[in-house]
């Protein structure tokens, strides 16, 4: 969490970003809030980036003002115009790229005064794993599959039995690059697997973490997985 | 076709001052940001300066900041870079570079000499 | 500022051979990187950015990739036309800065 103050003759006003994470082709949210004004018109938001000539966004007596938008960003770019009063100042990037990474500001004027504060935002792809037994094996086998990863991640599996126990003799984990050639597929297999047992496989890398468990009883298959961003945290 | 012609260049007492110019044709100027990068004698490259579409905003190198100012008339579809308090370090090939549709330096002009020199 | 070291600054090659020139970046970059061609006597002519996208009209012998802090101009079959100076610039962060080039030239 970023807390900025503005710095003018006019009054500060308090400013708060948090840093996040973009997933690569999707959309993502730059989040900036601030202290609210009560006329719509006298707020001018606008979004800056390290290393961008133009501006990646600016909202100001009650609309997008886009003359001195950067070329990177046309288009993809909106503002949360009906939050705005309430004091949302975050921004929706769409179709987020690689690139996009990097030291935004949300620089924000009102009648109360002048405020800034900096978002570290990052760019990744990260998906759920899905795992499954793998009945083409020729012993009791599971693979996990996550269809988009980038950076390159760690995979680990990991048993409630065997807790603690190292599979990385008896696993095995691939990348495939995917046609965009940005992000990657990740397989891992897992050999020798016993039933009436839970197995996890976690992906990692900077950006996000994500578990697929599978549970396999000789009646059933219960399946689970979940993903965190890492490192969101607010200025 | 996106053209970029420089011109301006010349042999400049130190302390001395210059104005190039970019006339730039083919594309929507207005749009893009435009920089100013010289290559000096032995081939190093240096971003000198960048101008944002709409002209609000500017960025230079520290060692040209207060020294090089960068404009530009959409009206005209010019940039421009005066240079002020010249030094022989500042000799160089200076080269007006357009932002694309893809990135900061998608198109290179044929570039201006600049010699600063006793 | 961000320091691009490039390299090597230069090398020898046979038509046909597949070189690969690399930039380090001195922190990560994110992708925000492009390759230039300078030919002798000439201006620039942009060949890859972002990385890994190639510029329209640029020979598909060209192809860039990395990720972080290292990228590399790898150019598959070399042509007679290839011979020429290479080099690297980033776009991350002000001030943009550039590698110290690459020569390449007919062994």
């Known amino acids: 969490l970023i807390i900025g103050f503005g710095i003018s003759g006019r009054h500060s006003i308090t400013v708060t970003t948090v840093a996040s994470a973009g997933n690569i082709g999707e959309d993502g949210i730059l989040s900036c809030t601030f202290e609210p004004d009560i006329k719509l018109s006298d707020i001018v938001i606008q979004w800056l980036k390290e290393g961008v000539l133009g501006l990646v966004h600016e909202f100001k007596e009650g609309k997008d003002e886009l003359s001195e938008q950067d070329e990177m960003f046309r288009g993809r770019t909106a503002v949360f115009a009906d939050q705005v009063i309430v004091g949302n100042a975050s921004l929706r990037l769409k179709n987020v790229q690689l690139t996009d990474a990097g030291t935004y500001k949300c620089y924000i004027i009102t009648s109360k005064g002048k405020g800034n504060a900096n978002l570290e935002y990052k760019t990744g792809a990260f998906s759920m794993p899905e795992v499954n037994v793998d009945y083409n094996a020729s012993s009791e086998t599971l693979r996990c599959e996550a269809p988009r990863w980038f950076p390159q991640p760690t995979v680990v599996w990991a048993s409630q039995v065997d807790q603690g126990a190292n599979f990385s003799e008896v696993s095995n984990t691939s990348f495939e690059l995917n046609s965009e050639n940005v992000t990657m597929k990740v397989v891992s297999v897992l050999y020798n697997v016993t039933i009436n047992n839970t197995y996890s496989c976690m992906i990692e890398n900077d950006i996000a973490k994500a578990t697929g468990d599978i549970k396999v009883t000789e009646s059933e298959i219960k399946r689970r997985s979940h993903l965190q961003l890492l490192n969101s945290k607010a200025s | 076709e996106v053209q970029l012609v420089e011109s301006g260049g010349g042999l400049v007492k130190p302390g001395g001052s210059l104005k190039l110019s970019c006339a730039a044709s083919?594309?929507?100027?207005?749009?893009?940001?435009m920089s100013w990068v010289r290559q000096t004698p032995e081939k190093r490259l240096e971003w000198v300066a960048g101008i944002n579409g709409g002209g609000s905003y500017t960025y230079y190198l520290d060692t040209v900041k207060g020294r090089f100012t960068i404009s530009r008339d959409n009206s005209r579809n010019t940039l421009y870079l005066q240079m002020s308090s010249l030094r022989s370090e500042d000799t160089a090939m200076y080269y007006c570079?357009?932002?694309?549709?893809?990135?900061?330096?998608?198109?290179w002009g044929q570039g201006t000499t600049l010699t600063v020199s006793s | 500022d961000i320091r691009m070291t490039q390299s090597p600054s230069s090398m020898s090659v046979s038509l046909g051979d597949t070189v690969s020139i690399t930039c380090h970046a001195s922190?990560?970059?994110?992708?925000?990187i492009g390759w230039l061609q300078q030919k002798p006597g000439k201006s620039f002519k942009a060949l890859i950015y972002h990385g890994t996208n190639l510029e329209d009209g640029v020979p598909s012998r060209f192809s860039g990739s990395g990720s972080g802090a290292d990228y590399s101009l790898t150019i598959s079959s070399l042509e007679s036309e290839d011979f020429a100076d290479y080099y690297c610039v980033q776009y991350a962060q002000f001030p943009y800065t550039f590698g110290g080039g690459t020569k390449l030239e007919i062994k």
């Open positions: 083919g594309f929507t100027f207005s749009r893009y940001g």
């Open positions: 570079v357009s932002q694309g549709s893809n990135y900061y330096f998608d198109y």
């Open positions: 922190q990560g970059i994110s992708s925000n």
